[in-house]
Structure formats: C-alpha cells, structure tokens
Interface confidence: low
C-alpha cells in the first residue's frame, strides 16, 4: 500500500541535522609503520570564500612510537580562516599562505605549498615521506584527523572515489543534511516520527552511530517515535533529551546505559517503507526524515513537539552574502599580544579585504589611542598604564573599538592580557569527591581526587588540564593519568569542574610489585585559554605536588613496577 505523505523540506527553525562522517568523495588510507614522517594530504573544496574551518589533529600513542613527525599538506581552492588544534604534535604544515589564514598563530613549522594540480601535490608530498592518508572534502566545517591510526591494507596511498577513511579522518560538512517532513494522511493525534536513514558506507566493518536527539519542548508535550534504519553492521548509541519510542535496525543502547544492548528490528530500507513503518506506529506527522551517508555522530535538533508541521519552499541562506562585511568575523580576527607590560592588537589588512570590510578606525576604549597603519596591518599598542586599561589582580582589560564603513555604530570586543606575575597555580589532592579536606597522601586501592586551581580566579580565561602524570621514582616509573586533555586508562576519570571552573579528576592507583614507592610527584600541565577570541595569549604552566604513598595492596590497575 502506498503511504500518502508528501515529503517537503523543513525550515531550519523546525529541524536541523548535522553529522560527522568518515565517508569522502575521494580518498585513501595506507600504512607506513616505519616512516619517520607521517604524511597526510587534504584537498578542500569550498563553494565560496572566505570560509571558516576547524581542524583538529589527535595523536594516539601506539607501542610507544608516537609521536612521529607529521606533515600535513593542505590544498584549498579559496580563502579559509583556519582554527588549528594540534596539541603536542610535532607538526609541519604545508599550505598556500595567500589562501589559508590562521585565526591564531599555528605554533608549528610551516612550508609554502607550491601551486600544483592535485596529482603533483600528491607527488610532492610523497617525496617527503610515504603518504598515510589523503582525502578530498567538499565544504567541511570541521575535520578531525587521527594520527597513528591508519588501518589501511594499502602500502601506497592512491586517491579512489567514494572511500571510507575509517578512524583516520572524520569530518562535518558545513551544509546541514536535508531535512524533510510531511503529514501522514488519515492518522489522527499528535504523535510525531523522526526518521533517520543511514546509507551503506564503503567499509562493512561494525560501526556505532551516535545519535543525539534534542527536541525543544516540555517532556509532557511529546509523543514521538525515533526510527533509525541502517546497514546490518550498524548499531546505535542514542543520546536523547526526551523519552520516546525507539524503532531501529541492528542493536541500540542509550548513552546513560551504554553497556545494555537492545535488539532492534528488521526495517524496510526504502523511504516509502519507512514512512509506512511510521504510520504503523500511529505517527500523524513525520517531523523529520533524513538520509545520510554512513556517519559516526548525528545530531538532530527539532522543535515540532507534535504541533503543526511547517515546510519551507527553499533552503534559507545561513551565511551572509559574499559581498557584505561580517562584523563578528572581523572582530574575531583581531589578535591580542601581551608582552613587556604592553598590550598590542594586530589586524591584518589582507583578512579585512577578504571579508569585504572597509575599516575607518581602530582604537582602544580611549578613542585617543588609535592604531597605526603599518602597510599590511593595523597595529594598536599601549602600555598597561594608559589608554583606559583596567588593571586587576589577575588581568589587564580593555576594549577594541572598530569603526567600519557599512555600520553606523562601532563594533566592540573585550581584550585581555593575563597578569602572570600575580597568578599562582595550585594542585590539591583530596580523599573524597566532596573536595573538602586536602591531603598529601594516597593509598593504593583507594580513589584519590585532584583539583587544579588558579588564584586569583580569571573569569575571561578557561583553566584546562592538558596532561598529568605521577612520577613514582625508579621503582614505580611514570603513570600517565591525563594526556591531551583526556583520561588515560580506566582507572582515571575526568570529573565535572568545581563551581568556580577548576578542573578535577580522580584516579585509582594499584601496584603489581613490591617494593611500593613511599613517595611520588604528581605533575600536571595546565593551560589558561581565552574563552573567546584568539588563542595567542594561551598560557601553560606545570604544577607539581609531592605525595606520600601508604599501605600495600597488590591487586589491580595502573602502575608499571
């Protein structure tokens, strides 16, 4: 029986689906286990410039070989503002400096990429070392490149159409997936269906797709069913903010009980069949119907709540027209530098031109402090003692004021420098998760709780734990607790920060051998990062704490003996 339900695009205010996938239009993954240099090549196509891109490189330590040096070759077809995160990775970056602009200094070794066609770029990269991965991506918003992960069977990377990059590369397209909706004719009531169809990928290995469902309505107002259909090798991990009926292929589990797998059903693999399934489940509205390539994370935001469905005749433009100046983007390009008791703001003219902005003035809060025009950039500099600087115990603050031709009112942005001389970082060890009574003693087999604090507190900056390790001397060796802001092993847990935002974690220490060390040193590297704007004022500190270790316990978990 044909189901009458005329699928039409739904406006983004009613439903939006974003996703992360490892499927690429062209790509390859190869293994180069003994290479000193791990080479990755990205060909990025953007429909219009300038675009913003978040690129994260993540290292996975395998057999003690990481990190090798990494060469990342970035080939783009138009202007890109790049936010690069590659913490602790010995990275060399080859790119076209006239097209790629960093939102903050990359802090890595860079090389100018010759203007070659694709095949020659691959050859140029291969001369520097065996290519581990290469991929062609169309209009990415963010890319995650996992290093040391190559599972490819190939020993030589050759671009092939429609490839699955596995764990090596995941990316999020800028354009959300097309969300369609319709009324199921002849069904009464307000029950709504959200249907997500994941199309088969190019690698048939077992996959878990995380589905985040956020429905903005009160729980009592909702009667909904979530239908997830995908290839047989796909299982689902559901993270939903509402209770709803779940109907899936394969197996599924909930984020709150990830180990509890629930068997799904055999579902039809055609749009018509899935609409029929929704009807059978008494849904009167298909609030969202989405077809996606094989994804790792899918986020559905919807606000229908069983109400009247609205469809939109055409996609709504979400990016500003190419020829208008975006003040927000412009303000994000102001770089703040803090040195020699002075604050310096830099705004590169080339970037301003990319944004089609005409600047008529750049000053601090005190308008008499004007920027110098230094040919290729505007530079605004002031000592901490003038230009309306506000000096507090922890920070020096001011405001960047930019006048642009296309706007009658000036654009303002808070700018800050840290007063490093007055900041102190402390590590605290506690024996309970209430973090009340500090201690300097850990007991094997008992959980220990750690908190890092900066004083005085700095509200505009975020205190983050980059890494922590416990040095147990020659007998105990080093126990890595946190690396790359992630917990190492199952005996370490990152906890919610304190109400003041102080990072916290817990760890459990066991020993397999004797003698058990009597003392150890807990060492953590912390970073203060601006909550907004550029990362040029990022500050790193290593904090130490001497610990005593009591009472033997020979069962368990972490340390090498």
């Amino acid at each position: 029986e044909t189901v009458h339900c005329d699928l039409q695009p739904v406006g983004p205010e009613r439903g939006e689906v974003t996703y992360t996938t490892s499927q690429v239009s062209k790509g390859c993954v190869a293994q180069a286990p003994n290479a000193i240099l791990e080479v990755h090549v990205l060909f990025l196509e953007f429909p219009t410039g300038p675009s913003q891109l978040e690129l994260t490189l993540q290292a996975s330590k395998q057999n003690g070989t990481w990190p090798r040096e990494v060469l990342l070759v970035l080939s783009v077809n138009s202007s890109v503002f790049l936010h690069l995160q590659a913490l602790g990775i010995p990275l060399h970056l080859a790119y076209n400096s006239s097209l790629v602009t960093f939102q903050e200094p990359p802090g890595v070794n860079t090389t100018e990429l010759p203007s070659f066609p694709k095949t020659q770029i691959l050859e140029w990269a291969a001369e520097r070392g065996p290519i581990t991965s290469a991929a062609e991506l169309n209009d990415p918003q963010s890319i995650l490149l996992r290093l040391g992960q190559a599972q490819g069977s190939l020993s030589f990377c050759m671009l092939e159409a429609s490839q699955d990059m596995g764990r090596t590369l995941e990316w999020r397209p800028r354009t959300p997936a097309l969300v369609r909706g319709c009324h199921l004719e002849g069904v009464a009531g307000h029950k709504e269906a959200h249907i997500l169809r994941v199309l088969p990928g190019h690698s048939a290995g077992p996959r878990t797709v995380t589905v985040k469902v956020e429905l903005s309505c009160a729980p009592g107002d909702l009667d909904a069913v979530l239908i997830l259909q995908g290839p047989p090798y796909v299982s689902w991990l559901i993270d939903a903010n509402h209770n709803m009926q779940i109907w899936t292929t394969g197996e599924y589990s909930f984020k709150i009980f990830p180990e509890k797998n629930i068997r799904g059903f055999k579902l039809p693999d055609t749009p018509q069949g899935l609409l029929g399934e929704a009807r059978m489940l008494n849904a009167s509205i298909v609030a969202s119907f989405v077809e996606l390539p094989l994804a790792s994370i899918v986020s559905l935001h919807a606000s229908s709540c069983g109400g009247r469905l609205q469809t939109s005749p055409a996609p709504i433009q979400t990016t500003p027209p190419k020829d208008t100046c975006s003040p927000e983007l412009l303000m994000s390009l102001i770089q703040t530098k803090c040195a020699d008791d002075a604050m310096t703001l830099v705004l590169k003219k080339e970037l301003v031109a990319h944004l089609k902005c005409t600047i008529t003035g750049l000053t601090f809060w005190d308008p008499s402090c004007e920027a110098e025009d230094r040919g290729d950039k505007f530079v605004l500099r002031s000592a901490y003692s003038s230009c309306g600087m506000q000096v507090s115990a922890s920070m020096i603050s001011n405001e960047a004021v930019v006048n642009i031709l296309s706007s009658s009112s000036p654009q303002r942005k808070k700018v800050h420098c840290l007063n490093m001389d007055s900041l102190s970082f402390q590590l605290g060890l506690y024996l309970s998760p209430h973090f009340l009574q500090a201690s300097n003693t850990i007991e094997p087999g008992q959980q220990s709780f750690v908190q890092v604090r900066v004083s005085p507190s700095v509200s505009e900056f975020l205190l983050q734990l980059d890494s922590c390790h416990l040095d147990l001397g020659p007998e105990g060796g080093t126990v890595e607790l946190i690396q790359g802001r992630a917990a190492k092993g199952n005996c370490v847990s990152l906890l919610s920060p304190s109400p003041e935002g102080d990072p916290r974690f817990s760890f459990l220490l066991h020993f397999y051998t004797v003698p058990i060390p009597k003392t150890g040193t807990l060492s953590c590297t912390v970073a203060l990062r601006p909550k907004t704007g550029s990362q040029d004022q990022e500050v790193h500190r290593t904090v130490f704490m001497r610990l005593n270790i009591i009472s033997p316990d020979l069962s368990g978990c972490t340390s090498k003996g």
């Epitope: 000193i36 003690g64 070989t65 990481w66 990190p67 090798r68 040096e69 010995p90 400096s97 960093f102 200094p105 990359p106 802090g107 890595v108 070794n109 860079t110 090389t111 100018e112 390790h469 040095d471 080093t478 790193h540």
Partner: antibody
C-alpha cells in the same frame, strides 16, 4: 654552504646588559627557526631562546631561567638574529651559540663568549 | 622538564673496539638527537630522530632506542671519534640536553 656567525660577547658586570648578534648566510633565512643555545662548564649545553619564521608569526619562546630578562628578535632583511640580554647574572656566563632548528639543530655558529663578573 | 641522563660520563676505548653510550630520559620521549663536540669547536649534528645519521657522519655510527632509553653505538672506534657526545630531546617543553659522554681513546 650554511654559515652562522655570532658577535657581541664580552665582559659585563652583574645587572648589566649585552646584545648578541648572529649573521646568517647560505640558506633562506626568513623560512628558518633560529635559536640561541649556551654552554658553560657548570650547566653544560642549555637551550636559551627561539624565534620562529614569518610563516609562524615570528613566535618567540624562552627558557624559564631567562624569561623576562632576554629578548630574541630577528631582521629577515639582514638575515640576522639577535639576543638582547638584560639583568645579567653570573650564571649567564658561557659560550652562546646561534643555531638553526630544522627537526634538530642542524647548523651551529662558532659561538661568542659572555662573561658576567664584577 | 625532561631530564636526560647520559652514561657513562667518560668512556675509554681502544681503536677498533665497539662502544655504546646511553641516554635515559626522565619521561618518555618520541625521539632523540645526538651531537658531537670536540674541544674548542661548536657542537655538530650527529644523529637525528633517534637513528638517522646527519650529513657526513661515518656509517660506523648508529643510534637506537625508544621511550625513555636511547643509545649511540660506534661499531669500530677510530681516533677521530674522540669527542663529547650530547643527547637532546624536544618531545616535551623545554628542549633539554644531556650532560654528555666523553669518549677517550686509549
């Protein structure tokens, strides 16, 4: 042939200042990350400071022991790198080498000697 | 910071002998570089990224290691090898050098 030539060393009193220079030739200086490394009998080889290339925004990095006292700078048009040293202490005494970092210190100058003594 | 401990501090060898010197790091590092220095001269790059010989270094030299333990080996020592050898890491800030192993010929 890559050549690095340091100058500017000498005798200075504690608390005084001194500026070292390093003239480079034989390679594309503007692309290079340049460092100062010092050597003393007491402390051995010790990294002091680094200034990166234009492509890396001429970012500067310092050893904790010299932070706030030493300033590294460069002039790409003159293929030169400098080390301005203020508030000098006796423990800053040593031979100062200008080096180029390319995955390791692949080129070293002959060194210039700084003596801090009253 | 990562402390590099070189041993032995002084190594005495006869020409033709095989010698090995070690460099231990206080924490795991991704690779090690080695430099050779002769009295009155500046250090010279000798081995980079653990096992790669710098330009002009004789093939009797080799480097190996991983994690916290690295070594430099000379298969058959020659008179011209008498020098001090320093290891260096930059897997973790700050960049650090070892105190050196002085190779003397008997």
């Amino acid at each position: 042939e890559v050549k690095l030539e340091e100058s500017g060393g000498g005798l200075v009193q504690p608390g005084g200042s001194m500026k070292l220079s390093c003239a480079a030739s034989g390679f594309t200086f503007s692309d290079a990350w340049m460092d100062w490394v010092r050597q003393s009998p007491e402390k051995g080889l010790e990294w002091v400071a680094e200034i990166r290339s234009k492509a890396s925004n001429h970012a500067t990095y310092y050893a904790e022991s010299v932070k706030g006292r030493f300033t590294i700078s460069r002039d790409d048009s003159k293929s030169s790198v400098y080390l301005q040293m203020n508030s000098l202490r006796a423990e800053d005494t040593g031979i100062y080498y200008c080096t180029r970092w390319r995955r390791f210190f692949d080129s070293w100058g002959q060194g210039t000697t700084l003596t801090v003594s009253s | 910071q990562i402390v590099l401990s070189q041993s032995p501090a002084i190594l005495s060898a006869s020409p033709g002998e095989k010698v090995t010197m070690t460099c231990r790091a206080s924490s795991s590092v991704s690779y090690m570089h080695w430099y050779q220095q002769k009295p009155g001269s500046s250090p010279k790059p000798w081995i980079y990224a653990t096992s790669n010989l710098a330009s002009g270094v004789p093939v009797r030299f080799s480097g190996s290691g991983s994690g916290t333990s690295y070594s430099l080996t000379i298969s058959r020592v020659e008179a011209e090898d008498a020098a001090t050898y320093y290891c260096q890491q930059w897997s973790s800030n700050p960049l650090t050098f070892g105190a050196g192993t002085k190779l003397e010929l008997k």
